[in-house]
Amino acid sequence: RTTTCFGDGCQNTASRCKNGGTWDGLKCQCPNLYYGELCEEVVSSIDIGPPETISAQMELTVTVTSVKFTEELKNHSSQEFQEFKQTFTEQMNIVYSGIPEYVGVNITKLRLGSVVVEHDVLLRTKYTPEYKTVLDNATEVVKEKITKVTTQQIMINDICSDMMCFNTTGTQVQNITVTQYDPEEDCRKMAKEYGDYFVVEYRDQKPYCISPCEPGFSVSKNCNLGKCQMSLSGPQCLCVTTETHWYSGETCNQGTQKSLVYGHHHHHH
């Protein structure tokens, strides 16, 4: 947010940049929260655009019984590991195929015990205000599905008739991490000392961090013909004077006709 200055007054302007604004030789370069020739005005909306997607990561352990552990499986670049990874990934893609939020699996470690597979199940959803609920539900379905498959796909007579077989008791969910996104908190932080007056409103499921000086929202302050200006004590209406009227009042809704005042008469609209 910059305002260019030309002429003799510029040097004076330079020393008068307010609110942390810096002079670049032509204009005041204003910090995010401010605008105007001297950075004297507080913006009425702050971009807190959410990420397009929110991710979750589930740390799981399953025990694969249809493969015997060999030392080569510790080496992630070995043919053995690569083949195991391919089969395991294909198997998990089948297991979680009904979950729209499912992205894939990432094997972190293979260890002895048949083959104990430490891995992450990766989930992702489009950002909406309900993303936490969506991902919570998805993690529950993941738990259900992996429990079901590790109970059903088991070795019979030392042979697996499925793509992979599992130890029913070897399935554990270690940890669930969801990317945190709190628009209200972000809005408060970015509004700094004006945080008490900025709020989050949603439009088309997208959050907007706005002060009452931003028009078009439910919290918007109607200053009528005046101008809404933010101060440390909150939003205020700066009322205007026209050729014919003075405006006053909390929302500049009281107009006084000048001619009537000069004629010692007051008239309110």
Partner: nanobody, 123 residues
Amino acid sequence: EVQLVESGGGLVQPGGSLRLSCAASGFTFSRGSMSWFRQAPGKEREGVAIISSDGWTGYADSVKGRFTISRDNAKNSLYLQMNSLRAEDTAVYYCAASFLVLRALNPKAWHYWGQGTMVTVSS
């Protein structure tokens, strides 16, 4: 590159015998697992027998006691001795390989395949 070439298929009478061979190249044959699968016309591919590098062998119930799987690591070869053949054994027989020590007779668990050899059991 892994290459598997089957041979030994043919026409045999019910009750007869046949020995299938699979010549392997492009990998360390002595490691991992080898197996035989078969696919009858109009049916899904099914596991027949498996042998691992540790010597473990496993068989489908339908061939137990009649078929024997073996390997010769020096010759990079896999074999399937088929005795007491029945009409229902008629199928294309495939050799499959894995770098893993597998205990699975599901085709989805196997990554490397030969082209197959036809076995017809008929009088």
